[in-house]
Interface confidence: low
């Protein structure tokens, strides 16, 4: 399908002008290529009428132009002094007329209505309010005032000053007669319907002395605003319906093939399941205006959208509406990124979030979509640090890999973390994206001890076990803070032969702190990555305590939380109840080693990756 988009139907009246805007993907090639407006003939050929290269056909000379706006990816065709002959089928497009990078536009120019002299024309959108002004002379001040609608040759009474109201206008019309001295009465019609369209006659008095005034009421369906957005991107519909419906329920609906309108979201709590996790209705401002944000745009989201107000929260005739025609461009600048990321309970996820690469300095955010009521998205983390304290130690936003993508890591997953999350920046709002986190059955790949208690001044060694499939990945330990995760100095992993015969049970990357200080208390992450792309992480909390005074019962200087079927013995080692340890390496993986001896390398914190056979039980 062509990525060029414009208005499907344009209608106007003889003598008037039209302005037709066409959209195209703003790639470098498209921005500089020829733009055209052509008319389709009976043969199927499309004859150029005006182009961006300065060509104007003789038929359009002096009354038409084409202006390209390359920075917006749009061009506009203006045509003035329209005649009935201009009605027909046209194309706006890029490149060569026959190439197919175009959009079909139907133009209909109708004859203006033959109106009696002195007719006042009122042009109002459907659902809105019109005030018809009716002047009269002093002698008709005490006499009956009335408004008629002309239907063919007859006049049908709509309202009069004797309290008559035509049933078609019940509860939405009033006649106002001013105080003495003002020689004008007004008729106010609310919630205009398309059927209200037509010629009206104001009348004051009767007989040959009566005052009459013609009024032509043109009730228009709102011209849909064209909205051109990228696949996977985001759109915002701003809906301003006026103060008169400020306290009425609001909705956004999409017009279907039957020309009825299916509710997408409303303020009464209804939401189309197709938009689950990717829609927000921002609560309305005092003036009754509101906005709806939809992210993760799909091709099937294309169509005509209406926003409106009605106590039922859905479209009803005669209530104000606003319209948009949404086109979703498949030649998207927004890169593909997973819309679903799966993790296991206790494990982690690393989510890639796209942003406009031209806005590398923009603030980055991640929020959790909440579906209650109209939906909202509390921020969890931003590029300057953590926002929600309950995510301490398990959530971090990283600027890597950069150049249009940032990373969010969430670990210590539970089933409650399942849900929809939004990637945001304070820049280009069209780059908002949605990702769903699903928690599936399985075990975390990285294994670390439970919480660890370290002793001041001594050496702490924390193991992180990884499976063979990660042997080619870069392993790291980092210390978490609410502004990120600071990688700790890493030692070489040793000769590559060590990984050739990968023993599924023997891969360790160890963190050594020597000597332990008060500042070492906190969360540490063990993780794997490939270049700037992050994989799984596992978190461990290190608490720091004073050395026990002589005479007190001895407990291992650095102990991991005992698993449910283990007990910590006074000797500082674990006994696994009712289980024979057949392979000492299995125990070594779980052992947190404390050593008061000097560390050979002399560095305070180091990371070592080796097999447990190489590591043995000693601190490196």
């Amino acid at each position: 399908k062509s990525p060029v988009f414009g208005p499907q139907e344009v209608s106007s009246v003889e003598g008037n002008s039209v302005s037709i805007k066409c959209y195209y993907p703003p790639t470098s090639v498209n921005r500089h290529t020829r733009k055209y407006w052509c008319r389709k003939g009976a043969s199927g050929r499309c004859i150029t009428l005006v182009s961006s290269e300065g060509y104007v056909s003789s038929n359009y000379a002096g009354r038409a132009n084409l202006t390209n706006f390359p920075e917006n990816g749009t061009f506009v065709v203006n045509i003035a002094q329209l005649s009935r002959d201009d009605s027909g089928h046209y194309k706006c497009g890029l490149g060569i007329n026959s190439r197919g990078l175009s959009f079909d536009v139907s133009l209909e120019v109708s004859q203006g209505p033959e109106l009696p002299n002195g007719t006042e024309v009122y042009t109002v959108d459907v659902g809105r309010t019109v005030t018809i002004k009716c002047p009269f002379k002093t002698e008709n001040a005490p006499k009956t005032k009335a408004l008629y609608k002309k239907i063919g040759q007859t006049s049908v009474l709509v309202i009069d000053s004797r309290n008559y109201v035509n049933p078609n206008y019940k509860d939405r019309i009033r006649l106002r007669i001013p105080g003495t001295g003002q020689l004008i009465f007004t008729v106010v019609i609310d919630r205009l319907r398309l059927s209200d369209h037509g010629l009206y006659l104001c009348q004051a008095g009767d007989g040959s002395n009566r005052d009459e005034k013609n009024a032509d009421l043109q009730v228009l369906e709102p011209e849909p605003e064209l909205v051109y957005e990228d696949l996977r991107g985001s759109v915002t519909f701003h809906c301003a319906l006026g103060l008169e419906v400020a306290n009425v329920a609001k909705f956004l609906c999409r017009v279907n093939s039957r020309e009825t309108c299916d509710v997408v979201i409303n303020t009464l709590g209804k939401r189309d399941s197709a938009f689950e996790g990717r829609i927000l209705l921002n609560p309305q401002d005092k003036d009754g205006s509101f906005s709806v944000v939809i992210t993760g745009l799909r091709k099937e989201d294309e169509g005509r959208y209406l926003c409106g107000a009605h106590s039922d929260g859905q479209l009803q005739e005669g209530w104000p509406i606003q319209a948009w025609q949404l086109f979703v461009n498949e030649e998207s600048t927004i890169p593909r990124s997973p819309t679903v990321v799966k993790g296991v309970a206790g494990g982690s996820v690393a989510v890639l979030c796209p942003y406009n690469p031209k806005e590398s300095q923009s603030l980055k955010y991640w929020c959790l979509w909440e579906g209650a009521q109209n939906g909202r998205c509390p921020l969890l983390v931003e590029s300057q640090g953590l926002v929600q304290e309950q995510y301490e130690g398990r959530l971090s936003l990283l600027q890597e890999p950069g150049n249009g993508t940032f990373t969010v890591i969430l670990n210590q997953l539970t089933t409650q973390d399942a849900g929809f999350y939004w990637c945001l920046t304070n820049g280009d709002t069209r780059w908002r994206t949605t990702v769903e986190i699903k928690i599936i059955e399985g075990e975390p790949n990285l294994k670390v001890p439970g919480n660890v208690t370290a002793v001041l001044g001594e050496t702490l060694n924390i193991p992180c076990h990884f499976p063979c499939k990660f042997s080619s990945y870069e392993k790291y330990w980092c210390k978490w803070s609410n502004t990120g995760c600071q990688t700790l100095p890493s030692q070489d992993e040793g000769p590559s032969e060590a990984f050739v015969n990968c023993d599924e049970n023997s891969r360790l990357v160890s963190l050594t702190l020597n000597p332990v200080t008060r500042a070492d208390e906190g969360w540490y992450w063990c993780g794997v990555k490939q270049g700037h792309f992050y994989g799984e992480t596992a978190a461990v909390y290190v608490a720091v305590e004073e050395k026990k005074v002589a005479g007190s019962r001895y407990v291992s200087p650095a102990k991991a939380d005992a698993a449910p079927d283990e007990k910590v013995l006074d000797s500082g080692v674990r006994e696994i109840e009712n289980k024979a340890i057949q392979d000492p390496r299995l125990f070594a993986e779980e052992k947190v080693v404390a050593d008061t001896g000097d560390q050979a390398g002399g560095s305070r914190a180091s990371v070592d990756s080796s097999s447990s056979e190489e590591q043995g039980g000693s601190s490196k």
Epitope: L280, N282, P283, Q284, D285, F290, S291, L363, Y365, C367, R376, C377, P378, L379, E382, Q384, G385, V387, Q388, W422, L424, N426
Partner: nanobody, 124 residues
Framework: EVQLVESGGGLVQAGGSLRLSCAAS????????MGWFRQAPGKEREFVAR????????DYADSVKGRFTISRDNAKNTVYLQMNSLKPEDTAVYYC?????????????????WGQGTQVTVSS
């Protein structure tokens, strides 16, 4: 969590002006929607004004429109409420509030962080 401290309240004659300040600590507020609310004795806490994180969008209660102006200085981590043409009915405790919600408009329920309040008394 962000801590908010209001200052600038006091006693002023009707028609006078006051400028309230709300200083934030604990974290930067340049991503927070910030607002001012007030509570008169025996009444519910009511919305006065709010400003989005960039300062580009503001909103006011009808009762203060044209008289009060909300502004922010993200570099100083501070939000201000300039109150002109004060009336006796403006007498209340004024609270500063912050919201980390990504939302175009916030009610008092959406504000997670609150200051202790500063008393404004307008005498006739």
């Amino acid at each position: 969590e962000v801590q908010l401290v209001e200052s600038g309240g006091g006693l002023v004659q009707a028609g006078g002006s006051l400028r309230l300040s709300c200083a934030a600590s604990g974290r930067t507020i340049n991503t927070y929607v910030m607002g001012w609310f007030r509570q008169a004795p025996g009444k519910e806490r009511e919305f006065v004004a709010r400003i989005d994180w960039s300062g580009s969008s503001t909103d006011y209660a009808d009762s203060v429109k044209g008289r009060f102006t909300i502004s922010r200085d993200n570099a100083k981590n501070t939000v201000y409420l300039q109150m002109n043409s004060l009336k006796p009915e403006d007498t209340a405790v004024y609270y500063c509030a912050g919201s980390a919600y990504y939302s175009g408009y916030v009610t008092h329920r959406d504000f997670g962080s609150w200051g202790q309040g500063t008393q404004v008394t307008v005498s006739s």
